[in-house]
Amino acid sequence: TLNSVLNSNAIKNLPPPLGGAAGHPGSAVSAAPGILYPGGNKYQTIDNYQPYPCAEDEECGTDEYCASPTRGGDAGVQICLACRKRRKRCMRHAMCCPGNYCKNGICVSSDQNHFRGEIEETITESFGNDHSTLDGYSRRTTLSSKMYHTKGQEGSVCLRSSDCASGLCCARHFWSKICKPVLKEGQVCTKHRRKGSHGLEIFQRCYCGEGLSCRIQKDHHQASNSSRLHTCQRH
C-alpha cells in the first residue's frame, strides 16, 4: 500500500559519506500552473481521509505528530495526528504546530525556524509499490544529526531545517532531504489545502521567508481552484 511505501522509504537510508538525513514531509497542496499533481489520489481527498501510520514524528506532515490515537493506547499502533495549537497541552516540541514549541507542557510561540522547519511540497506522487531502493543501502539506517557539527549548505543532506544554514530549510529531494533556499518574495510557493493528506513527495520546496506568507497571486483570483498560483507576499 502507499502507506507501507511511505514508511519503508521514510528518510532512513543515506550512506555515511553523504551526511545527515531528513525533515518533515509536507501536506496536501493546491496545484499551481506548471506544477502537476496526480488526480484521484485517495490520500489527498478530504472526504476519504485515512489515518497515516507512523513510527516517528519525521514521518508525518509539518502540521502533525506521531502518537497513539487513544490516550494510554498501544504504543505499537501510532498514527499521524493533527498538531496542537498555541496554549494546548504537549509533551514534546513535535506535538506543537509550526511556529510553536513545547514549554512546560504547553505549546507556546517560537520564532519560525527555531525548532521545526515547515516544508512545503511541490510535487506529490503516489507510488503504489513502485518505489526504489536507494542504491542498495539499508532502509533502516537512521543517521543522527548529532554527528554533524557544521550547518548544512545548499544541497547538503539534512535531517531537519535546524541542520541547515541560515536561509535554508530541509526539504525532500527524491528519498533524501537536502538543504534548499527559503522562498523569497514573488517566488512560487505551495499552499497547504488541509492537514493529514499524504503522498510521497519527490521534490519539496521551503516555506516563505520572514515577513512573507504564501498567498494567491492577485491576478489569479479568477482561476479555478486547481490552478491558482500562490506566491510569497508581504504580510
Epitope: 506548471g34 542504491d135 529531494h173 537536502i178 534548499k180 533556499p181 510557493c189 520546496r205
Partner: nanobody
C-alpha cells in the same frame, strides 16, 4: 524560468526500445536533479526514474528496473531515459521534472509513448 522539453516518444512494438530526452533551457539552468514520471489514461502520475547530481545517485521504480536507464549529458543540459524491453503497460505520456534551487519545479509538456502488443 527554466523550460523543459521532452522528445523521443512514439509508437513502438512490445519488446522494442525508445530513448526519451529532456532538454533544459531558459535562464542559467541550475538543478539538484531531475526525474521522469509517466501518466497512463485514467491513472495517476507515477515516478519512473530519477537522477540526483546533488547526491550522486540514480533511482528507478521497481516496475521498470532492469529495463529503463536514466542518464544525463552535462554539456547539453539534457537528461535521457533509455527504455528497453518495452511492454504495453508502459504506454503513457512521459514527463520530466526538475528540482531547482529557486524552488520552482519545472515540468515539461510530456511526450507520448505507445507500445503495441
Amino acid at each position: 524560468e527554466v523550460q523543459l522539453v521532452e522528445s523521443g516518444g512514439g509508437l513502438v512494438q512490445a519488446g522494442g526500445s525508445l530513448r526519451l530526452s529532456c532538454a533544459a533551457s531558459g535562464r542559467t539552468f541550475s538543478s539538484y536533479g531531475m526525474g521522469w514520471f509517466r501518466q497512463a489514461p485514467g491513472k495517476e502520475r507515477e515516478f519512473v526514474a530519477g537522477i540526483s547530481w546533488t547526491l550522486g545517485r540514480t533511482y528507478c521504480a521497481d516496475s521498470v528496473k532492469g529495463r529503463f536507464t536514466i542518464s544525463r549529458d552535462n554539456a547539453k543540459n539534457t537528461v535521457y531515459l533509455q527504455m528497453n524491453s518495452l511492454k504495453p503497460e508502459d504506454t503513457a505520456v512521459y514527463y520530466c521534472a526538475s528540482d531547482g534551487p529557486d524552488a520552482y519545479n519545472s515540468w515539461g509538456q510530456g511526450t507520448q509513448v505507445t507500445v503495441s502488443s
